[in-house]
């Protein structure tokens, strides 16, 4: 029987150039007597050309909505309504080229052509883009708001702030042709429910959507974003309501970055340099395609590429990489951006070298990528440290912290947190090496503690980089480093002439000179501890509200021991920075760490001392009691304590931990506590110092207050974040 | 490698004293709180007294408190039990045990030493 | 006289399960880990089960532990004959400041 046809609506998108008239500022008003003639004149035109071809039979509606420089750009959007088994033959591609041919056919024509009665279409200039009618009406829906703006060479082009009568405003941006657009967002605000998104093309096309940003985020509180070209649509979608726009946007057209590179590594491991996308840290544009050929002095090298926050992995499928594309001797990877380092070890085979490939699959692009490469040995790729084939990264092996994913590190190990005597391979506890006294059978503890050995585990890393057997021999009051640095910045870590946590005892004045108090509007939010002049430590999770992520809301008191009265002794300050650790993760508590910037030095006194910060190597041994201190809740639900708190709790394994745990402590955490629960953190202890004693009486960070199941319950303890998992970070900062 | 090393049982006559010694090696003693625990020939187990591991903290069985004192010299690694007043009923295998981590009860036991109270 | 009840005696066939219990009350098992100790004929303690459910290293995965409120329980299955010894519950006990052991349950593989 007869089945009548199914018609489909076919929407497209796209620009024309007119080369015989000139855009005008009266052009971007569309109240404008100016636009509206304009708009009449070059729908009649659209609507001409598309009904001069053989599209004509299935049109159904178009619009010009926009104009914009070079001489005159019209840009419009049309719907055809065709059988649907036409569907995939009327590509915008082919519907481009159909358009075209029919310009290029009466381009030298003396006939009377209805579409070129008034314009002189450029048939270069015209571009055709798959659109949808949810695109239509997301571009509808910003017409009462719509800014279009061009921005020449050279200039860094303010954008005025969104109607905030309107719900959605556009942004439609131009620049010179052969340069790219360079977009700055900055957040003003702590909180908004804003949202923005970025297009490589005039229009919201979902398709061509490079990147969608909401609410002030603080991860991001300044994005830049580039196009692959000279023209960008930026729509604005309102949050809660407010008189202050909660963004700044700026643009500036800039030049095309080449990303090529060829290169010739030195013979020497570690990193040597920096590769980059373009204009990095700006994310990278949508067409972006790098290219980094870098050659090895020898075979026995491998090259190791070490990201940030972005690791490789393999994708199933042939499936497009949504986080940029990568090809390494001929394998295809794709991008992932993690909340954890990451490093990629490519085995050299030939001395040809190696060709790395970064491509941009997809119009959707993300934060720039930067990669710091180096050699790595290819027999011994981490001299004294384990290489987790997870994450390619060297971490310490046997030190009772499984800190390769698969727990591998921690596998077959004779001696695990201990150290192993040469004699009969019997293990003692790390204390007892290099202690002046014999352990092992033929003393092998004792030997080469006054001479550099081979960097391992629980070495320590003098300045001149060069490593001493014995452990922790930070500030002890002997030299052990040839340079001496193992007692440099050795000013920290005393207790001031003196003498709730639950379970606690109350403190007294410069017992714990570290410990800081974190208000806002003179309440006690959090614990914290001075670690340098300027620097004060706490957990990342005291933040974790947006209405707490500001600087201006916090004051730091240091000195203070009673929460109700001041005393000489104590001292407050503004706080000029807020850095959380870029990979704290809120829902596992990973990375639990913050640095808080004083808005002057410390005048350092008997109430007021930083604490000293351990090594990497640092060994806090599970089963030394510690202390922790501050003015938390007493009882779990409880009011926070107006006498600072503090109270002994013991360092627990790893792997007990984690069992308690079921496995939610990673490597960045420490547990410790009892199993009589009872003496344990609280409500408001959150960021405060767990400290160890070392035998030079000076007292270490080995942790901060972050999380636990509840205050002082029986058979979980306290968790802490492990300061040795995140020095680097905070010395990269403080520093 | 944890290794607990109880002296100094023996048989004694009621109303004595006798004072065991537990030697400990193997890990830092100084870090947990080390307990005795005894028991009386074909019977059960039953809990003497714990020190803590600063030796600021110590509790007793209800029918020993008052006759037996625990304590611990950590420089030489060493947990004793003086037990003054001795009766028959005391008698008994004191084995020593050592707390595990977090104050886990008796990861690790000595092998005894036997204590007999009889004229 | 215990505060911590176990049953003085359980028998099962090689190969089977068997359960022990143990019960006690707030201040003892409902607020503090309990730990299970194993004591063969002649032999020292050994711990066998830690914080109510953890297997020490060493320890045969055919043994382990739960608890419920105010009481806990051991289970031992595929049963040997090495099994047969006497077992020990034991918790801190809050009011009494001290250690409770339970009376011991001697298990008999038939």
């Known amino acids: 029987g007869y089945k009548a046809e199914v018609m489909v609506s076919q929407v497209y998108s796209g620009s024309l150039r007119v080369l015989n008239r000139h855009f005008s500022q009266d052009l971007t008003r569309r109240e404008s007597s100016a636009f509206r003639s304009e708009t009449a004149k070059a729908q009649k035109m659209l609507k001409e050309l598309i009904t001069s071809t053989r599209l004509g039979t299935y049109y159904n509606s178009s619009s010009v909505y926009s104009f914009g420089e070079g001489p005159l750009t019209c840009f419009f959007w049309f719907i055809l309504q065709i059988p649907e088994h036409r569907r995939l033959m009327l590509s915008p591609e082919v519907v481009q080229a159909l358009l075209v041919e029919e310009l290029l056919s009466t381009v030298n024509s003396s006939a009377a052509v209805p579409y070129r009665a008034e314009y002189e279409v450029d048939p270069e200039g015209l571009v055709i883009l798959e659109a949808s009618v949810k695109d239509i009406a997301a571009l509808n829906s910003t017409l009462g708001c719509y800014r279009y703006s061009y921005v020449g060479q050279g200039q860094v082009l303010r954008l005025k702030g969104p109607d905030h009568l309107a719900s959605s405003c556009l942004w439609h941006l131009q620049g010179p042709k052969d340069l790219m657009l360079k977009l700055r967002l900055e957040w003003t605000l702590a909180e908004c429910r804003d949202r923005l998104a970025m297009y490589d093309v005039a229009g919201p096309l979902e398709k061509r959507l490079i990147t969608s940003v909401y609410g002030c985020s603080r991860q991001e509180p300044v994005v830049e974003v580039l196009a692959s070209g000279a023209i960008m649509a930026v729509v604005w979608k309102k949050g809660l309501h407010s008189y202050y726009d909660p963004f700044v946007l700026s643009v500036q057209p800039v030049v095309f970055q080449a990303c090529e590179v060829n290169l010739t590594l030195d013979n020497r491991l570690d990193s040597q340099g920096v590769l980059s996308t373009p204009y990095f840290p700006s994310y990278y544009s949508p067409q972006t395609h790098c290219s980094w050929h870098l050659t090895v002095p020898s075979l026995d090298y491998g090259l190791a590429l070490w990201f940030d926050a972005y690791a490789l992995r393999r994708q199933k499928y042939d499936l497009p990489c949504t986080q940029g594309q990568w090809t390494i001797q001929n394998r295809r990877l794709c991008g992932l951006r993690i909340l954890q380092p990451y490093a990629e070890r490519i085995p050299v085979v030939a001395t040809a070298g190696i060709t790395i490939n970064f491509t941009s699959q997809i119009s959707l692009t993300g934060p720039g990528v930067r990669v710091h490469y180096g050699l790595y040995n290819q027999s011994d790729p981490c001299p004294g440290e384990f290489l987790c084939s997870v994450n390619g990264l060297c971490v310490p092996a046997c030190d009772g912290v499984k800190d390769c994913p698969n727990g591998l590190d921690e596998r077959n190990c004779v001696c695990r947190a201990t150290f192993q005597c040469k004699e009969d391979s019997t293990c003692i506890s790390l204390p007892k090496v290099c202690d002046g006294q014999p352990d092992c059978l033929n003393g092998s503890d004792e030997e080469q503690c006054q001479e550099g050995v081979p960097c391992g585990t629980f070495t320590f890393q003098c300045e001149d980089r060069s490593c001493v057997k014995k452990p922790n021999p930070q500030c002890d009051g002997r030299p052990d480093c040839r340079d001496g640095s193992d007692e440099e910045h050795c000013d920290c870590g005393l207790q001031g002439p003196s003498s709730r946590i639950v379970g606690g005892a109350v403190s007294s004045e410069g017992e714990w000179p570290w410990q800081a108090s974190l208000q806002v509007r003179g309440r006690h939010i959090c614990g914290g501890a001075l670690i340098a002049d300027r620097w004060v430590i706490t957990a990342a999770h005291c933040f974790q509200e947006d209405s707490m992520a500001s600087t201006v809301l916090w004051t730091v008191f240091l000195g203070k021991v009673w929460q109700n009265s001041r005393w000489p002794g104590e001292v407050s300050f503004k706080v000029s920075r807020l850095l959380l650790h870029p990979y704290h993760e809120e829902d596992s508590h990973d990375y639990d760490v913050a640095l808080l910037q004083l808005d002057h030095p410390v005048v350092r006194s008997a109430a007021v001392r930083p604490v000293c910060l351990p090594a990497r190597s640092h060994f806090f041994e599970p089963g030394l009691h510690c202390w922790i201190t501050g003015w938390g809740a007493l009882r779990e639900g409880g009011p926070i304590s107006n006498a600072l708190q503090k109270v002994d709790v013991q360092l627990i394994p790893q792997d007990l931990c984690s069992e308690v745990y079921r496995y939610q402590v990673t490597p960045r955490m420490l547990c410790a506590g009892y199993r009589k629960g009872k003496k344990d953190a609280c409500q408001g202890d959150s960021g405060g110092p767990l400290v160890c004693k070392a035998l030079s009486g000076r007292w270490f960070l080995a942790g901060l207050v972050s999380w636990g199941l509840g205050c002082g319950r029986p058979n979980y303890f306290g968790v802490y974040t492990r300061i040795t998992g995140v020095i680097s970070w905070i010395q990269q900062v403080v520093t | 490698q944890v290794q607990l090393v109880e002296s100094g049982g023996g048989v004694v006559q009621p109303g004595r004293s006798l004072r065991l010694s537990c030697a400990a090696s193997?890990?830092?003693?100084?870090?947990?709180?080390m307990h005795w625990v005894r028991q009386a020939p074909g019977k059960g187990l039953e809990w003497v007294a714990i020190i803590s591991y600063d030796g600021s903290d110590k509790y007793y069985e209800d029918s020993v408190k008052g006759r037996f004192t625990i304590s611990r010299d950590n420089s030489k690694n060493t947990l004793y039990l003086q037990m003054n007043s001795l009766r028959a009923e005391d008698t008994a295998i004191y084995y020593c045990?050592?707390?595990?981590?977090?104050?886990?009860?008796?990861?690790?036991w000595g092998q005894g030493t036997l204590v007999t109270v009889s004229s | 006289q215990s505060v911590l009840t176990q049953p003085p005696s359980v028998s099962e066939a090689p190969r089977q399960r068997v359960t022990i219990s143990c019960s006690g009350s707030?201040?003892?098992?409902?607020?503090?880990?309990v730990n299970w100790f194993q004591q063969l004929p002649g032999e020292v303690p050994k711990l066998l089960i830690y914080?109510?459910?953890l297997l020490p290293s060493g320890v045969s995965d055919r043994f382990s532990g739960s608890k419920s409120g105010t009481s806990a329980s051991l289970a031992i299955s595929g049963l040997q004959s090495e099994d047969e010894a006497d077992y020990y519950c034991a918790v801190w006990d809050d009011s009494l400041n001290g250690v409770l052991f339970g009376g011991g349950t001697k298990l008999t593989v038939l």
């Open positions: 193997g890990f830092t003693f100084s870090n947990f709180d």
């Open positions: 045990a050592k707390d595990g981590y977090g104050s886990s009860l008796f990861d690790h």
């Open positions: 914080y109510d459910d």
């Open positions: 707030s201040s003892n098992i409902g607020n503090n880990a």
